[in-house]
Interface confidence: low
């Protein structure tokens, strides 16, 4: 006799990085037929949504309207059917940006590089925070942290086409919080002779709206938003 | 820094309605809810509804349905609670506060309903 | 909608003693719970939230505990300006609901 019911999906939309005093939901899909949702905050009950009709609905949302460092941190959630309880989902780690100070973003030797050639970004912030995020924008971004006082290093080793995109960094006040990003550096990188037709670049955000990426709410994107979260909070485990 | 600054003082005659503003500044009004409390003179804190500015979707007490209308004015960054059908009991100092833990709050408006 | 009792309903202490106020919610609401101080005159101000986690700016010697049904608010040492009436408030659901207060008053 099954004890559990399979456990919901959890994701933010339009993202897990939120700046801060903007809005973001939560979602958790779970199945049709569940009577009531339970949203997790850091272990405890933060939210509890009951659907109604239960039968026609497998998706709630939790909406936050002014993000902040308090609302930063660790989801999960579950849901009932009758008197069974799903399993948890897995960690949602919902991150605060736009706090305190913008960081600066280097590249050497360079912005635009050859294939091979070995190419380190510098993350700097001269207040206090040890820990710096390295971010390529697009879908399948790579998140990379970075030690140091004020600096991190970020090492790409010989660089590819692969490495092609525009970069940026932030510094991480705890795992939750995130200043600014800084502006963006763009890595062109040229190939050989039969490589140098540009291939197709990740699905990326709009080009104008790193900024106020919050804003933009791609319904398309919201699976690939999740995969893309899942990679990163990879890192902030 | 983040500020709600309320209308004045309002002395109303049984039966009338008054209209309470908040205005937000500080921040971006359109995300954050802004939910309006009210205490009777030496009484505790009663929680009256909210507004979400940016859908203007509001919700209400049970005890004041019917006579509690909560508008806003985004383009003034402007939440208003207008409170009809006066009688002597709703005089009291009237809240706004913002977001779900209350973290900011308006200075008070009383409002005194007498004949 | 949840009830919240707090007690007591007023207390005196002296400059220094430790303070304890507690709050019973009607129901589990889990750690859904603020506290708030508010002076004569004044609009209330956010302590903690979240049953124990201390606002921005707020002294240290205010902390917050429990969850489910039974929460304490503790001043460690009290000092001249925590004379005042505390509220607690769950979030858990609407409506939000408030205890009827606590007067912290000098003895």
């Known amino acids: 006799q099954q004890q559990t019911l399979p456990k919901p999906f959890i994701w933010a939309e339009p993202h897990f990085m939120v700046p801060k005093e903007k809005q973001v939901t939560i979602c958790c899909q779970g199945n049709y037929g569940a009577v009531e949702y339970q949203l997790h905050f850091e272990g405890s009950l933060f939210a509890v949504d009951r659907p109604k009709p239960p039968e026609r609905i497998n998706k709630v949302q939790f909406y936050i309207p002014d993000m902040n460092s308090r609302m930063a941190g660790q989801y999960s959630c579950i849901y009932r059917v009758g008197e069974l309880w799903s399993e948890p989902s897995n960690l949602l780690d919902l991150v605060v940006t736009e706090m305190y100070d913008t960081p600066t973003l280097s590249v050497h030797p360079g912005p635009e590089v050859i294939s091979g050639e070995k190419v380190t970004f510098y993350c700097r912030l001269d207040t206090a925070t040890s820990m710096f995020l390295l971010l390529k924008e697009g879908r399948s971004s790579h998140v990379q942290r970075g030690y140091g006082k004020v600096q991190a290093e970020f090492p790409l080793g010989p660089v590819t086409t692969a490495h092609r995109g525009t970069y940026r960094c932030f510094g991480s006040y705890n795992n939750h919080a995130w200043s600014f990003p800084s502006e963006p550096v763009k890595l062109l990188v040229t190939g050989d002779i039969e490589n140098t037709s540009l291939a197709p670049e990740d699905p990326t955000f709009p080009a104008d709206t790193w900024g106020t990426y919050l804003l933009t709410t791609e319904t398309g994107l919201q699976k690939d938003h999740a995969l893309w979260d899942h990679t990163a909070q990879n890192l902030l485990r | 820094q983040v500020q709600l600054v309320q209308s004045g003082a309002e002395v109303k005659k049984p039966g009338a309605s008054v209209m309470v503003s908040c205005k937000a500044s500080?921040?971006?009004?359109?995300?954050?809810?802004i939910h309006w409390v009210r205490q009777a003179t030496g009484q505790g804190l009663e929680w009256m509804g909210y507004?979400?500015?940016?859908?203007?979707?509001?919700k209400y007490s049970q005890r004041f349905q019917g006579r509690l209308t909560l508008t806003k004015d985004t383009s003034a960054d402007t939440a208003y609670m207008e409170l009809s059908s006066l009688g002597s009991e709703d005089t009291a100092v009237y809240y706004c506060?913002?977001?779900?833990?209350?973290?900011?709050w308006g200075q008070g408006t009383l409002v005194t309903v007498s004949s | 909608d949840i009830q919240m009792t707090q007690s007591p309903s007023s207390l005196s202490a002296s400059v220094g003693d430790r303070v304890t106020i507690t709050c019973r919610a009607s129901?589990?609401?889990?750690?859904?719970l603020a506290w708030y101080q508010q002076k004569p005159g004044k609009a209330p101000k956010l302590l903690i939230y979240?049953?124990?986690r201390l606002e921005s700016g707020v002294p240290s010697r205010f902390s917050g505990s429990g969850s489910g049904t039974d929460f304490t608010l503790t001043i460690s040492s009290l000092q001249p300006e925590d004379f005042a009436t505390y509220y607690c408030?769950?979030?858990?659901?609407?409506?939000?609901?408030f205890g009827q207060g606590t007067k912290v008053e000098i003895k």
């Open positions: 506060a913002r977001t779900y833990y209350f973290d900011y």
């Open positions: 507004i979400n500015p940016g859908s203007g979707k509001a």
């Open positions: 500080g921040y971006t009004f359109t995300t954050n809810n």
């Open positions: 129901q589990g609401i889990s750690n859904a």
């Open positions: 979240a049953a124990s």
């Open positions: 408030q769950q979030h858990y659901s609407t409506p939000p609901t």
